[in-house]
Interface confidence: low
């Protein structure tokens, strides 16, 4: 009779993480008598996966009933596969011996490759807000995928970005891999509603890539523009001066009126109006009693936006020596000065 051969018909098996791997093995003869063992790897450091004779292997089940006397099918199933299970598995026949069984013949081995999906990409932006025309960096990370081949793209509002750098780690062989990418984005005044998207495509994601997003509203600061104007008022001795605060983001803003350098009133932006681009407008007004002033009055609208240094805009009220001539048309003149 021919000597027993251990046949592992599959050189390689490809399994998705979480699935069950079937490793096939048959013997060509019932003799010599003795158990089968499965190992991962070869040599002295090999790892025991299944022992027909003894032991507890909760993730392993046999394909056929190994207690049957005439059984020659020693295939096993390993459940809930993870990338850590990748490797070459050997089906080894032992000959019954005393006191220990002796290794008789090994199969050629089956390489188990595990396909694992990347984790959802996490996009993070800069810690501090930046103003339009500045370049900011976003990072994107995804982990736990296998094989190593992966594609990462960056988009801003659907437009693909080209200024980014990507690394896949580790460089050598590993059970699973991680990707890290940094993209540079130039901010514009219209970016409050913008989104940066990191898109990861992998062989395990045939249907759709995974996406991570970051809203530029969390990154951008659009400083306000100020305009101080004088409004006509019916009352002869009163002038209404308004400060228009336009196109700012985020909403956090405090405004202070100064009369000749002295604080007249401070208020916080509350009932703002929102522009289409996501920025805000706000208006504050000051009623000035001209008859209470003997000299010209310098009115300053000072705005502190989102904790930044204050910006201001001033307006000069000319106080005439003849109160009756102080109509709304002649009472003031806007100098248009813009001070910091």
């Amino acid at each position: 009779e021919e000597e027993l051969q251990v046949i592992q018909p599959d050189k390689s098996v490809l399994v998705a993480a979480g699935e069950t791997a079937t490793l096939r093995c048959t013997a060509t003869s019932l003799i010599p008598v003795g158990p089968i063992q499965w190992f991962r790897g070869a040599g002295p450091g090999r790892e025991l996966i299944y022992n027909q004779k003894e032991g507890h292997f909760p993730r392993v089940t046999t394909v056929s009933d190994l207690t049957k006397r005439n059984n020659m099918d020693f295939s096993i199933r390993i459940g809930n596969i993870t990338p850590a299970d990748a490797g070459t598995y050997y089906c080894v026949k032992f000959r019954k011996g005393s006191p220990d069984d002796v290794e008789f013949k090994s199969g050629a081995g089956t390489e188990l490759s595990v396909r694992a999906k990347p984790s959802a990409p996490v996009v993070s932006g800069p810690a501090a807000r930046a103003t339009p025309q500045h370049t900011v960096s976003f990072t994107c990370e995804s982990h736990g995928f296998s094989p190593r081949d992966i594609t990462l793209k960056w988009f801003k509002n659907g437009n693909e970005l080209s200024d980014f750098q990507t690394n896949v780690d580790p460089v050598g062989e590993s059970v699973s891999y991680s990707i890290h990418s940094t993209a540079k984005v130039v901010l514009t005044r219209e970016d409050v509603h913008s989104q940066v998207i990191c898109e990861v495509a992998h062989v395990t994601l045939q249907g759709d890539p995974l996406r991570g997003t970051a809203n530029l509203s969390e990154t951008i600061r659009v400083p306000p523009t100020l305009e101080v104007t004088q409004q006509p008022v019916r009352a002869e001795n009163q002038v209404n001066v308004t400060c228009q605060v336009r196109k700012f983001y985020p909403q956090r803003l405090q405004l202070t009126w100064l009369e000749n350098g002295n604080v007249s009133r401070t208020e916080t932006a509350s009932t703002v109006t929102e522009n289409k681009d996501g920025t805000y407008n706000w208006m504050s007004w000051l009623l000035v009693n001209v008859s209470a002033h003997r000299d010209d009055v310098k009115l300053t609208c000072q705005v502190e936006h989102d904790g930044q240094p204050a910006v201001s805009k001033s307006h000069d009220l000319k106080v005439s020596a003849h109160p009756k001539e102080q109509g709304s048309n002649t009472a003031a003149e806007n100098t248009g000065s813009n001070e910091r």
Epitope: T151, G158, L205, Q206
Partner: antibody, heavy 123, light 107 residues
């Protein structure tokens, strides 16, 4: 030459089930996702969903959850569509169509289609 | 779901004509749009992907344009074999959706 070859027409009674096959020729089945598209008589095209041919993971469109099952046998390069508890309104031509898979340049466009399988449900 | 609306539903033309079929998406699909041709009793055939690119073997008289929500398929110098039903399809968002079709008939 790339081809998707589907099984022949089927006549079934209401309540029965049917299994339509789609064999990939000229390319490796597991390199492309396989979609299923329904076309009722005289009607337009309706996407039923797809199966990830690498992992065997199916994704079903909203109206096709429950009675419809996508499966694979990679050893014979074949994708399957099984419909259970057939109804008269399931009468249609069923197409398999491949897509490149994840968003590539032509992402979810169906570049090759099977010839279609007519499933008629009638008592 | 993204609705795809084609117009017209049908049109008649003669050999040698130039025809335009439009497809409107209910929301922005970028350039993730394809066009297909289907003849009676046959499976659809892919013509255009990514809104503007012809598949290999598709004659140059077929051209696509558009992005966002509005797209067109233009067939210049109509040939007898071009009379068929044409479908647009978006693949920007799941579920993938098709237009209702435009039937091009001989005048």
């Amino acid at each position: 030459q790339i081809q998707l070859v589907q099984s022949g027409s089927e006549l079934k009674k209401p309540g029965a089930s049917v299994k339509v096959s789609c064999r990939a020729r000229g390319y490796t089945l597991t390199d492309y996702a396989m979609n299923w598209v329904r076309q009722a008589p005289g009607q337009g095209l309706e996407w039923m969903g797809f199966i990830n041919t690498y992992t065997g993971e199916p994704t079903y469109a909203q109206g096709f959850k429950g009675r419809f099952v996508f499966s694979l046998d990679t050893s014979v390069s074949t994708a399957y569509l099984q419909i259970g508890s057939l109804k008269a309104e399931d009468t249609a031509v069923y197409y398999c169509a491949r897509t490149r898979g994840y968003y590539d340049f032509d992402g979810g466009a169906f570049d090759y289609w099977g010839q279609g399988t007519l499933v008629t449900v009638s008592s | 779901d993204i609705q795809m609306t084609q117009s017209p539903s049908s049109l008649s033309a003669s050999v040698g004509d130039r025809v335009t079929i439009t497809c409107r998406a209910s929301q922005n699909v970028g350039t993730h749009l394809a066009w297909y041709q289907q003849k009676p009793g046959k499976s659809p055939k892919a013509l255009i992907f990514s809104a503007i690119y012809r598949y290999i073997g598709v004659p140059s008289r077929f051209s696509g344009s558009g992005s966002g929500t509005d797209f067109t398929l233009t067939i210049s110098n109509l040939q007898p074999e071009d009379f068929a039903t044409y479908y647009c399809q978006q693949y920007n968002t799941y579920p993938l959706t098709f237009g209702q079709g435009t039937k091009l008939e001989i005048k």
